[in-house]
Amino acid sequence: KLTIESTPFNVAEGKEVLLLVHNLPQHLFGYSWYKGERVDGNRQIIGYVIGTQQATPGPAYSGREIIYPNASLLIQNIIQNDTGFYTLHVIKSDLVNEEATGQFRVYPELPKPSISSNNSKPVEDKDAVAFTCEPETQDATYLWWVNNQSLPVSPRLQLSNGNRTLTLFNVTRNDTASYKCETQNPVSARRSDSVILNVLYGPDAPTISPLNTSYRSGENLNLSCHAASNPPAQYSWFVNGTFQQSTQELFIPNITVNNSGSYTCQAHNSDTGLNRTTVTTITVYAEPPKPFITSNNSNPVEDEDAVALTCEPEIQNTTYLWWVNNQSLPVSPRLQLSNDNRTLTLLSVTRNDVGPYECGIQNELSVDHSDPVILNVLYGPDDPTISPSYTYYRPGVNLSLSCHAASNPPAQYSWLIDGNIQQHTQELFISNITEKNSGLYTCQANNSASGHSRTTVKTITVSAELPKPSISSNNSKPVEDKDAVAFTCEPEAQNTTYLWWVNGQSLPVSPRLQLSNGNRTLTLFNVTRNDARAYVCGIQNSVSANRSDPVTLDVLYGPDTPIISPPDSSYLSGANLNLSCHSASNPSPQYSWRINGIPQQHTQVLFIAKITPNNNGTYACFVSNLATGRNNSIVKSITVSA
């Protein structure tokens, strides 16, 4: 089928286009080109007769067209009016006609665009700015670039007028950027020069530097003021409200005490019309001041509060030093120094943090020390201690109990017997006690500052007869050659003798056995498996005697080196191999086997039926005691002969 291809389809003004003919039939008489979508003699561009090779211009011929023998048409120096359809009329030798239509579009070469703005100096947080891309061009696409990036998504950015206008609402100083617009059509793309948006802002609140406010007499005072502002701010200085000078820096050499006062920097922006001021109070000391310590909390609660101690005054070019208990600061994660060492922070104070604390100011000549100060750390009460520790008394004696709990401020004490309040004293005294005075004796300690209370309860038994004692232990399952065990005979009773028996015999003499606490406590050092015996304690006084039930010590030991039985190491092929492993251990160990290093089974006995020479090798028994955490093993070589 006869077709026409436009090369290119989109043509720039002034360039050329080739209407290329495809599938031209054979045996042609001639052909003719027309402007438009149909054959119209009034719009003929050119005709061509093949026999004579003669081209004849038509009414629509502009002089810019060239026809080729293959029927293709070249149009040069394209103008806007050339846009549209072109029809080729082919006349075959048999005078049968065939037509095909092609088309192309003509676009102008775009000029370099430029940006116009409705506000060259917008004020921050107040003005809007509308950028327009010039010129307005038909069939052009408009794009915008900010700092060579595509437009960010922002509710303050709005495109309108077919993207030709970019509006920035409520401009901020961050909108100060390079803006470019770009125009595009199918034949060209052009980008404008940058336009820098100059946003007027400020002045912000000025910053006076340096920050320190304390100076020594004779020093130079050099204050600098800065406020973010566009255009740059104009600065004025006032001392105690009196205007000094219109400069960004204020310099006063060789200052005296008279230069103490309030120093005000005023920043003014002539374009926005705004003023902002900052005031700093400068103190000039006649001589190096004696330092002193300020605190945010001198009555901290233990384990709750932090305390910040600050060394005053703040002086430039000064080294700050600290001492606690007349020593330099210890290394501790609870002690933190600020960057300038001026503030010492105690995190989560304890009762040991009372001090005293001193700070020092070091200059070229000397170190000036502050007076020492202390912290009143509020703590407690801890669990009260009731003394004496006896729990058994004979009738007729006096009962005198004293209670003490570590506390700041000192605890207030209350006594309760069987839950009934008795008195608000630290000591409880009952004369000439009887069996009726037996019961639960509670001491309650209260800290009024922290609001905390703690209690301790003691059972008091008044009896002529001694009770049957019992044995308490600090370690029910000691490990051999590692642990010690302390047996204590309960209860503690006044005027009582304590005795001990082991397996029904009196105590053997041994450096590993030690009696203490009035023979009430028996300690076995470095226990062995042979200490696994029955222990009995006895109490006696002038009236009665009694013995405890026996307590058997369960000593954990082993595993010892295991033994594999039978001891044979040579076997005949076809025999059964039945190896048993045993190791002394408490508790019983776990057993496992390996043959030639390969794990087998977790049993005490290894059985292999009808062994062959393939069963030759090393047989290892491994034992493990989970309670002692210890392991042991043994290896046996087995030879099987054919």
């Epitope: 002193f292 310590i293 300020t294 605190s295 945010n296 001198s298 009555n299 901290p300």
Partner: nanobody, 124 residues
């Protein structure tokens, strides 16, 4: 028993002066850092001035610096607050506070013992 008793409060015109006294008893005065605090109606108690236990250092809130002076007389167990150039915003209940060998506490947590307060009213 420790007691701190403030006196010297009253009504004064703006620009006028007052001298507050705080008499301490039941404590070894020379070992106590003494402070003055004030509390205006509906406001929190705020630091005004303090003098360390040795008397060698004083410290003032920015709002009173240059107008108020704190001093102590260890022989009389008394601490003073001289208030000049008084302003209406100085109107408050003024409290005396003590801390044993304490640093100069800048918050109420810096003091152990407190007086009952004396009222200062600055009004025309």
């Amino acid at each position: 028993e420790v007691q701190l008793v403030e006196s010297g409060g009253g009504v004064v015109q703006p620009g006028g002066s007052l001298r507050l006294s705080c008499a301490a008893s039941g404590l070894t005065f020379s070992t106590y850092t003494m402070g003055w605090f004030r509390q205006a109606p509906g406001a929190e108690r705020e630091f005004v001035a303090a003098i360390i236990w040795s008397g060698s250092n004083t410290y003032y809130a920015d709002s009173v610096k240059g107008r108020f002076t704190i001093s102590r007389d260890n022989a009389k167990n008394t601490v003073y607050l001289q208030m000049n150039s008084l302003r209406p915003e100085d109107t408050a209940l003024y409290y005396c506070a003590a801390q044993h060998f304490g640093p100069i506490g800048l918050t109420t947590r810096g003091y152990h013992y407190w007086g009952q307060g004396t009222l200062v009213t600055v009004s025309s």
